[in-house]
């Protein structure tokens, strides 16, 4: 907290300019008018203030706007944004995408801070949903943003926004998140033809059900092993050897290297060894010939 002292003669700031970097903290407090600062916030970012000095400027704005800053000030905070606490940000009402971009730019190249997370949360809640432009902006600054949302939060993403999602944006998503995103992607890309559709839907397939994988196996998609390994185990298990062969195409040979890993391992255990042998890959662990497979889950459902 800077002590209240009178401004020395001739030092009263008439505008926000570079001369203020030579003011001591108490001089900034005494000689810079908060209203002047608020109207000339756009200049602050271009002036090489220390963070100690920015603390003083923040204090002045806090006194002027105890209920939270107006967006006209927020948009020009620049590096002063880094001095804000999540509590400060919760008082704001940020509605402009330009304001959001300006503040994210300040933190560019750094991991998401609590301030940024709070800002994004306030912005998205204010908009009511994660629209395409917002998602575009957020994933440009934070590729992992989408995967940081809960399935509940993801449910507010409209299918039209899915067009903004790049494969790398989904790298850290878990199956629960992909379960929510996949139906939206399916809806978003439904009017595309086979090969184009597969290119777009591929990164979302970790949320695909068995019937959709069966349908894809009829379309000569040649799914790569990396995508196959991210599929839901429960969706892969019911696939026949023939369907997996069609789904993977030339990549089917990669199953051998993955035979000890899920979902391949679990899928092998569900296949007849005879059928696995038709692949000629030397996959072992299937159901021996002559054994009868009873699906007890089906029996329980009927009784």
């Amino acid at each position: 907290e800077v002590e209240k002292t009178a401004c020395p003669s001739g030092k009263k700031a008439r505008e926000i300019d570079e001369s203020l970097i030579f003011y001591k903290k108490w001089e900034l407090e005494a000689c810079v008018d908060a209203a002047l600062l608020a109207t000339q916030m756009d200049r602050v970012n271009a002036i090489p203030f220390t963070y100690e000095q920015l603390d003083v400027l923040k204090h002045k704005l806090d006194e002027l706007y105890p209920q939270g800053y107006p967006e006209s000030v927020i948009q020009h905070l620049g590096y002063l944004f880094l001095k804000m606490s999540p509590e400060d940000i919760r008082k704001w009402n940020v509605t402009s995408l330009e304001t959001l971009k300006a503040l994210l730019e300040v933190n560019k190249g750094h991991e998401m801070s609590p301030q940024v997370a709070t800002l994004i949360d306030r912005f998205v809640k204010g908009r009511g949903q994660l629209d395409k432009d917002t998602l575009d902006t957020l994933t440009a600054f934070y590729p992992g943003y989408l995967c940081s949302l809960s399935p509940e939060e993801l449910s507010s993403v409209p299918p039209s926004s899915i067009w903004a999602v790049r494969p790398q944006d989904l790298d850290t998503c878990d199956p629960r998140q992909l379960d929510v995103l996949y139906p939206k992607a399916r809806l978003a890309f439904q009017n595309m033809n086979g090969s184009e559709y597969f290119v777009k839907i591929q990164s979302f397939l970790g949320g695909a059900p068995t019937e959709d994988l069966k349908a894809l196996s009829q379309q000569n998609v040649s799914m790569d092993l990396a995508t196959f390994m991210k599929l839901r185990t429960d969706a892969v298990l019911p696939l026949t050897v023939a369907e997996v062969q069609k789904l993977l195409g030339p990549h089917v040979e990669g199953l051998k290297a993955e035979e000890r890993h899920r979902p391949v391992r679990d899928w092998i255990l569900r296949q007849r060894q005879d059928d696995l042998d038709t692949l000629g890959l030397g996959l072992q662990g299937g159901i021996p010939n002559g054994y009868l497979v009873l699906d007890l889950s089906m029996q329980e459902a009927l009784s």
Partner: nanobody, 115 residues
Framework: EVQLVESGGGLIQPGGSLRLSCAAS????????MGWHRQAPGKELELVST???????YYANFVKGRFTISRDNSKNTLYLQMNSLRAEDTAVYYC?????????WGQGTLVTVSS
């Protein structure tokens, strides 16, 4: 984190010259601007000069025309060339880096101007 180590201080006669150096290490990519501050005995810390990443320089009125700030990016070093030194320039000189999201300071180097 950014680490700063100053050197080059010492005893010098009035009218003489000295060059201070400040070697920066650590997360130097996050540095926005750097500067030299000084604190004379019994006085407040004051800014002497600042230089931005694009090379824009600023000087306090009391050193204008006598001191020159510069940086060598290849050596990650900040300099302060001090000419026409006066007794009132006697102080501990501190190097400061303003980096994301705080200010980092060196331990200081003492400059004594005396005959």
């Amino acid at each position: 984190e950014v680490q700063l180590v100053e050197s080059g201080g010492g005893l010098i006669q009035p009218g003489g010259s000295l060059r201070l150096s400040c070697a920066a290490s650590g997360n130097i990519g996050s540095i926005r601007h750097m500067g030299w501050h000084r604190q004379a005995p019994g006085k407040e810390l004051e800014l002497v000069s600042t230089i931005t990443t694009v090379g824009t320089t600023y000087y306090a009125n009391f050193v204008k025309g006598r001191f020159t700030i510069s940086r060598d990016n290849s050596k990650n070093t900040l300099y302060l060339q001090m000419n026409s030194l006066r007794a009132e320039d006697t102080a501990v000189y501190y190097c400061r880096a303003t980096a994301h999201p705080t200010d980092y300071w060196g331990q200081g180097t003492l400059v004594t101007v005396s005959s």
